[in-house]
């Protein structure tokens, strides 16, 4: 029977800069029941606080709701593991909410084949930003990436769409069924997961000629 091994805070993520969650990995338990607590202080403070919510993020997590989340202050946090034989602490982790944003995937992905009489046909792709993101404040810039491939192909074709929420693709294989997905990332932070795939059948008469 031993004191617990050193835990590690290995991930922090925020869907929208308004709330965030951090997860830790326990060290060895020393063969005894072990209690974990996350404590933190914010830059410029010495007062330590305990995690406000150990439930929302699942096991070994701490969730910071709106009233506990500030974009302006860095959080300095650590996890304490305690059993009957003693305690161990994780390394301190510095968290700036701006740099942990991972949005939900974009919504309402719509894909349509457009065949104007006077111009080349194209695939028109349109989507909406994730619900939790408020783009109106100006705090957020979302960048988008599209990927598509014929249903049976192995390789994805990637297109960077910048900040726009619609995109045209001209070169496609006629008669093929395509999968299309989109994802987003803030100007700082992490790519979202890919949206659920939308399927589109490219007509056989879809031509890439002038």
């Amino acid at each position: 029977q031993l004191p617990p091994g050193k835990p590690e805070i290995f991930k922090c993520r925020s869907p929208n800069k308004e709330t965030f969650t951090c997860w830790w990995r326990p060290g060895t338990d020393g063969g005894l029941p072990t209690n974990y607590s996350l404590t933190y202080h914010r830059e410029g403070e010495t007062l330590m606080h305990e995690c406000p919510d150990y439930i929302t993020g699942g096991p070994n997590s701490c969730h910071f709701g709106k009233q506990y989340t500030s974009m302006w202050r860095t959080y300095i946090m650590m996890v304490n593991a305690t059993n009957q034989m003693g305690s161990s602490f994780s390394d301190e982790l510095y968290v700036d909410v701006t740099y942990i944003v991972q949005p939900d995937p974009p919504l309402e992905l719509a894909v349509e084949v457009k065949q104007p009489e006077d111009r080349k046909p194209y695939l028109w792709i349109k989507w909406s930003p994730p619900t939790l993101i408020d783009l109106k404040t100006g705090w957020f810039t979302l960048l988008y990436e599209i990927r598509l491939k014929p249903e049976k192909a192995a390789e994805w074709e990637i297109h960077f769409a910048g900040q726009q929420t619609e995109f045209k693709i001209l070169s496609l294989h006629p008669g093929q069924k395509y999968l299309v997905q989109v994802r987003c990332k803030p100007d700082h932070g992490y790519w979202s997961a890919w949206s659920p795939a939308t399927f589109i059948q490219i007509p056989s008469d879809f031509t890439m000629n002038d």
Partner: antibody
Framework: QVQLQQPGAELVRPGTSVKLSCKAS????????MHWVKQRPGQGLEWIGV????????NYNQKFKGKATLTVNTSSSTAYMHLSSLTSEDSAVYYC???????????WGQGTLVTVSA | DVVMTQTPFSLPVSLGDQASISCRSS???????????LHWYLQKPGQSPKLLIY???NRFSGVPDRFSGSGSGTDFTLKISRVEAEDLELYFC?????????FGGGTKLEIK
């Protein structure tokens, strides 16, 4: 504890290339971005670029595009920087450095001294 | 790129004195999120830099309280209130508000 291990020195010929390594330990390698910084003898520091080990997404200082290429091997928790077409201007100490979830450098490797000489 | 100008290049001080290092940026370091990402690092000969101060005025873990940072916008200062022998090293300011992140040229603190 967090450690970033780098070889002490590399002697290379002009016009060739070199691949510098930075082996991370004491933390989950894919959780934190890895940066590279250049320091020429007796001079200041220059930020080269950063890589996210979880998906290999990179962001480079424009000045080092075409000169430096950042990669990772997640199975060995090692970050690499490939420097190409070496000249005497590339003779410097190269550091790998890790932030937390922040945009400053909390942990630094000891640096690799690259000497480009015929 | 944001140019970081550090003065003086070399600062002779007596032990126990206060030392003051200035850092000026070519544009405002206020980020769109309201934070100012100006940091100070210390480097000893043959070693890698170490973080002293982050976001203008926050001492990093384990940094003695004789080190303090101040400033805003484009003008920043690192003060060492009572210089000790171990402080006679090279100091760099750094900004990470704008990509690429940039550093000052360094200030060497030396004995008068």
């Amino acid at each position: 504890q967090v450690q970033l291990q780098q070889p002490g020195a590399e002697l290379v010929r002009p016009g060739t290339s070199v691949k510098l390594s930075c082996k991370a330990s004491g933390y989950t390698f894919t959780s934190f971005w890895m940066h590279w910084v250049k320091q020429r003898p007796g001079q200041g520091l220059e930020w080269i670029g950063v890589i996210d080990p979880s998906d290999s997404h990179t962001n480079y200082n424009q000045k080092f595009k075409g000169k430096a290429t950042l990669t990772v091997n997640t199975s060995s928790s090692t970050a690499y920087m490939h420097l190409s077409s070496l000249t005497s201007e590339d003779s410097a100490v190269y550091y790998c450095a890790r932030g937390d979830y922040s945009n400053w450098f909390t942990y630094w490797g000891q640096g690799t001294l690259v000497t480009v000489s015929a | 790129d944001v140019v970081m100008t550090q003065t003086p290049f070399s600062l002779p001080v007596s032990l126990g004195d206060q030392a003051s290092i200035s850092c000026r940026s070519s544009q405002s370091l206020v980020h769109s999120n309201g934070n100012t990402y100006l940091h100070w690092y210390l480097q000893k000969p043959g070693q890698s830099p170490k973080l002293l101060i982050y976001k203008v005025s926050n001492r990093f873990s384990g940094v003695p309280d004789r080190f303090s940072g101040s400033g805003s916008g484009t003008d920043f200062t690192l003060k060492i209130s009572r210089v000790e022998a171990e402080d006679l090293e090279l100091y760099f300011c750094s900004q990470s508000t704008h990509v690429p992140w940039t550093f000052g040229g360094g200030t060497k603190l030396e004995i008068k």
